[in-house]
């Protein structure tokens, strides 16, 4: 039975040209996290594997940095980076947990962080 929940940074906004940290946290389970995949809509951005460490997709290497922790840092943001991001936690023995983050990249200098929210 899957008892865990993923807490994410939720709906967030950031300035064009700036950086943002995408962060998810798995709680309420003793399951072992074996791998975390980060996806942007239909693109694989990066993978963090318990044994192999990080793999950043080559097409994102210039603008994506691993961490902190199991999170992901996006740099040199453009308006095209606006959209949904997913953290997919592969765990044993529970299975797969998915968290969603919506990022809005703003032209203006006013970029406020949204509230945290949970996905069961």
């Amino acid at each position: 039975m899957m008892t865990g929940t993923i807490e994410t940074t939720g709906n967030i906004s950031a300035e064009k040209g700036g950086s943002i940290i995408l962060q998810c946290h798995l709680s309420s389970t003793t399951a072992q996290v074996t791998q975390v995949n980060w996806e942007q809509q239909d693109q694989l951005l990066a993978i963090c594997n318990a044994d192999l460490g990080w793999h950043i997709s080559p097409s994102f290497k210039d603008r994506v940095a691993p961490g902190p922790g199991l999170g992901l840092t996006l740099q040199s943001l453009t308006v095209n980076d606006t959209g949904e991001y997913f953290c997919i936690y592969h765990t044993y023995p529970d299975g797969t947990y998915t968290g969603r983050i919506f990022l809005e990249v703003l032209e203006s200098s006013v970029a406020e962080h949204g509230a945290r929210f949970q996905i069961p």
């Epitope: 074996t34 996806e39 693109q43 694989l44 993978i47 044994d51 997709s57 023995p93």
Partner: antibody, heavy 118, light 107 residues
Framework: EVQLLESGGGLVQPGGSLRLSCAAS????????MNWVRQAPGKGLEWVAG????????YYADSVKGRFTISRDNSKNTLYLQMNSLRAEDTAVYYC???????????WGQGTLVTVSS | DIQMTQSPSSLSASVGDRVTITCRAS??????LNWYQQKPGKAPKLLIY???SLQSGVPSRFSGSGSGTDFTLTISSLQPEDFATYYC?????????FGGGTKVEIK
């Protein structure tokens, strides 16, 4: 240099058993998921089974479920495929392949031929 | 199970030609799509992983694109050593499945 070397293939009668081995070298075997993929004569590729690294979770194609068992011995850097109740349609070249991040298969062995015939 | 449909099943081309092979998944697989090349009597060789990432050591004339359900492998300028069979494969979910293959032959 990464190397995968399959062995254990041969001729076996229908209903018989065979155990394939894949000896790995040149990388930290225990850190990688591993797969068996087969190819019947003149046909395409068919994934048979996979085993993850951290969890050791095992996955099978429906066509072999209940008959084949994938396993690994990390101390011997070896992957196995135990094949029971073999059928004529299991005749194929069997490849072992390394599966980093369980997303792609980057290194393959040279294959071992299994022929099931009376 | 996710079905992978490759087209065409075979094609004839000349050295220097631009060749495009397509692969369609029966459901969305994000970018969990890989391309392999196989020559007769040899093991498959990884060309492209995660839809568009070029495997180390593979010539840059090979490229991959697509996401969701529709994917493409392109060889920008076909070389003599590229005549082979090409397979797509999804790793979105088990059972892992391959396309039926595309045989690239000399015209």
């Amino acid at each position: 240099e990464v190397q995968l070397l399959e062995s254990g293939g041969g001729l076996v009668q229908p209903g018989g058993s065979l155990r394939l081995s894949c000896a790995a070298s040149g990388f930290t075997f225990s850190s990688y998921g591993m797969n068996w993929v087969r190819q019947a004569p003149g046909k395409g590729l068919e994934w048979v089974a996979g085993i993850k690294s951290s969890s050791g979770n095992k996955y099978y194609a429906d066509s072999v479920k209940g008959r084949f068992t994938i396993s690994r011995d990390n101390s011997k850097n070896t992957l196995y495929l135990q094949m029971n109740s073999l059928r004529a349609e299991d005749t194929a070249v069997y490849y072992c392949a390394r599966g980093p991040y369980d997303v792609w298969m980057d290194y393959w062995g040279q294959g071992t031929l299994v022929t099931v015939s009376s | 199970d996710i079905q992978m449909t490759q087209s065409p099943s075979s094609l004839s081309a000349s050295v220097g030609d631009r060749v495009t092979i397509t692969c369609r998944a029966s459901q969305s697989i994000s970018s969990y799509l890989n391309w392999y090349q196989q020559k007769p009597g040899k093991a498959p060789k990884l060309l492209i992983y995660a839809a568009s990432s070029l495997q180390s050591g593979v010539p840059s004339r090979f490229s991959g694109s697509g996401s969701g359900t529709d994917f493409t492998l392109t060889i920008s300028s076909l070389q003599p050593e590229d005549f082979a069979t090409y397979y797509c494969q999804q790793s979105y979910s088990t059972p892992l499945t391959f396309g039926g293959g595309t045989k690239v032959e000399i015209k």
